[in-house]
């Protein structure tokens, strides 16, 4: 025998109290698949969370974060405070990057400046709290009589630090 509930489409639930007829999901609830025996409560985007997509009878609400915060986790399950460039977020709030480190984003951690000498290069532009150093030609290339050097391309953008 076919389960009568399998005929209930998304946006409804199979109501055991009413002879297993398909009833619409009540307000502020949804069912995203057919054959459901209950509807799920809609997510509420409160506090730091803003509504990106309203809940409907067939799909949950989607949240993002208010300005000054960014999403973390699947489906923006958390909001994390932004900091300024040149800072990182700690348990004590936003703190400046220590000397020798930088952060060019509003999120993530401070990372060490590139060590140009590891690649046999010199420092062309010093690093700051907001920017990595720019490595230039090797010291040998700068010796008298060396051919002219094309200015180096800007340092590549570092990837996001793992959250």
């Amino acid at each position: 025998l076919q389960d009568p509930c399998s005929n209930c489409p998304a946006g409804t639930f199979c109501d055991n109290n009413r002879n297993q007829i398909c009833s619409p999901c009540p307000p502020n609830s949804f069912s995203s698949a057919g054959g459901q025996r209950t509807c799920d409560i809609c997510r509420q985007c409160k506090g730091v969370f803003r509504t990106r997509k309203e809940c409907s009878s067939t799909s949950n609400a989607e949240c993002d974060c208010t300005p000054g915060f960014h999403c973390l986790g699947a489906g923006c399950s958390m909001c994390e405070q932004d900091c300024k460039q040149g800072q990182e977020l700690t348990k004590k709030g936003c703190k400046d990057c220590c000397f020798g480190t930088f952060n060019d984003q509003k999120r993530g951690i401070c990372r060490p400046w590139t060590n140009c000498s590891l690649d046999g290069k010199s420092v062309l532009v010093n690093g700051t709290k907001e920017r990595d150093v720019v490595c230039g030609p090797s010291p040998a290339d700068l010796s008298p009589g060396a051919s002219s050097v094309t200015p180096p391309a800007p340092a590549r953008e570092p990837g996001h630090s793992p959250q």
């Epitope: 973390l72 986790g73 399950s77 909001c79 994390e80 977020l89």
Partner: nanobody, 123 residues
Framework: EVQLVESGGGLVQPGGSLRLSCGAS????????MFWFRQAPGEGLEWVAN????????YYVDSVEGRFTISRDNAKNSLYLQMNSLRAEDTAIYYC????????????????WGQGTTVTVSS
């Protein structure tokens, strides 16, 4: 249902005191870092203070350090913010929030927020 409910806001004169409370339900309160944030009129949300699971670590934004005290009572599933020497610039909606699962040195996200309680400091 996971829920946070703030109370204790009101109108107070400059230099006065208030104690905000935040009642938690629907989760194991003692397992989570907890936060206070605030939003002044026309401004963005600002972190105010946070406290670890057993209350042994507490941190504050510079502007409230020495005036505000965050505390918790895990037996009562409650978070508190004692606010002394209040100033006009403390006027805001105050929110309590829960640190997200896995809150750690690698992320400082919050996942559950209350509806807020309004504090007005005015003579």
């Amino acid at each position: 249902e996971v829920q946070l409910v703030e109370s204790g806001g009101g109108l107070v004169q400059p230099g006065g005191s208030l104690r905000l409370s935040c009642g938690a339900s629907g989760f194991t309160f003692s397992s989570y870092w907890m936060f206070w944030f605030r939003q002044a009129p026309g401004e963005g949300l600002e972190w105010v203070a946070n406290i670890n699971q057993d209350g042994s670590e507490k941190y504050y934004v510079d502007s409230v350090e020495g005036r505000f005290t965050i505390s918790r009572d895990n037996a009562k599933n409650s978070l508190y913010l004692q606010m002394n020497s209040l100033r006009a610039e403390d006027t805001a909606i105050y929110y309590c929030a829960r640190g997200g699962d896995g809150y750690s040195d690698s992320h400082y996200g919050t996942d559950v927020w209350g509806q807020g309680t309004t504090v007005t400091v005015s003579s």
